[in-house]
């Protein structure tokens, strides 16, 4: 088992909103849970966009999940990752 590296980035979306993206890479096996949470609760599927789980060329995998949030509410959102029985949460950078 190889645990993922998780990286959270932000980009301007529209006025008052930002898109936050959580990327997981370098993990094996390919099964992974990656999702955005607001106040510790998973956002509904239709408010998130997921990338496919793809091989990254090193025998490991990568994927991502993104959502749009209101600027100023970043501290209420975390990326939740679960892989091979381990889990972690990752904040939005300020």
């Amino acid at each position: 088992t190889v645990p993922p590296m998780v990286n959270v980035t932000r980009s301007e979306a529209s006025e008052g909103n930002i898109t936050v993206t959580c990327r997981a890479s370098g993990f094996y096996p390919w099964n992974i849970t990656l999702s955005w949470r607001q106040d510790g609760v998973s956002l509904s599927h239709d408010t998130q966009q997921w990338g496919d789980v793809l091989p990254d060329g090193n025998g490991t995998y990568q994927t991502w999940v993104a959502t749009r949030i209101c600027q100023g509410e970043e501290q209420r959102f975390t990326c939740y990752m679960e892989h091979s029985g381990n889990h972690s949460t990752h904040p939005v950078p300020s």
């Epitope: 607001q38 106040d39 510790g40 609760v41 998973s42 956002l43 509904s44 239709d46 408010t47 501290q75 209420r76 939740y80 029985g85 889990h87 949460t89």
Partner: antibody, heavy 119, light 108 residues
């Protein structure tokens, strides 16, 4: 001060419907997730439903899914629980609760409204 | 769904005694998503300990919480009369959210 006041409880026949309301005050209602939690007489707590601030993330307990609908009217600072196809096992005190930002958890509770399902 | 099992269901304690209750999850949960509530008869529950180990506002320092994975606990270092109540654990690691069945603490 944060205040949550439930209303709409009462006696309902099995198979009947009821709509509960929760009037919220003392905080910016449209920025907080909200829940309904119930407690049958002399029993423990049971989470019923969650709705986030923008009404775009909603979850239900398996015991009420398909029968209950949680909703909110942000301009009116009000939370609702529409209950249909009521059963005797739905008899309980229903609490409106505010979800704590960032950490989660039921940080504030109303006093509850009692729903009794009986013929 | 994640089942939370609390033990003991009932605890009779003397004043000044150390009291520990446990909450065991049916599958591993993040400590960020585990909370405890206190409820006294005829009253609404109160958030007591949040994210496993943080005391809610106004909670006496004799209370503490700990745990990880599937095993969590709440401890009262020295039991006082006002601590007699039922304590519930709660998780929102995964929907549906669930509560434990509660531990009722009484004065001996």
């Amino acid at each position: 001060d944060v205040h949550l006041v439930e209303s709409g409880g009462g006696l309902v026949q099995p198979g009947g419907s009821r709509k509960l309301s929760c009037a919220a005050s003392g905080f910016t209602f449209n920025t907080f997730g909200m829940n309904w939690v119930r407690q049958a007489p002399e029993k423990g707590l049971e989470w019923v439903a969650y709705i986030n601030s923008g009404s775009n993330t909603i979850y239900y307990a398996d015991t009420v899914k398909g029968r209950f609908t949680i909703s909110r009217d942000n301009p009116k600072n009000t939370l609702f629980l529409q209950m249909t196809s009521l059963r005797s096992e739905d008899t309980a005190m229903y609490y409106c609760t505010r979800w704590e930002p960032v950490t989660g958890g039921f940080s504030y509770w109303g006093q509850g409204t009692l729903v009794t399902v009986s013929a | 769904q994640i089942v939370l099992t609390q033990s003991p269901a009932f605890k009779s304690s003397s004043l000044g005694e150390r009291v520990t209750m446990t909450c065991t999850a049916s599958s591993s949960i993040s400590s960020s998503y585990l909370h405890w509530y206190q409820q006294k008869p005829g009253s609404s529950p109160k958030l007591w300990i949040y994210t496993t180990s943080n005391l809610a506002s106004g909670v006496p320092a004799r209370f503490s919480g700990s745990g990880s994975g599937t095993s969590y606990s709440l401890t009262i270092s020295t039991m006082e009369a006002e601590d007699a109540a039922t304590y519930y654990c709660h998780q929102h690691h995964r929907s549906p959210f669930t509560f434990g069945s509660g531990t009722k603490v009484e004065i001996k």
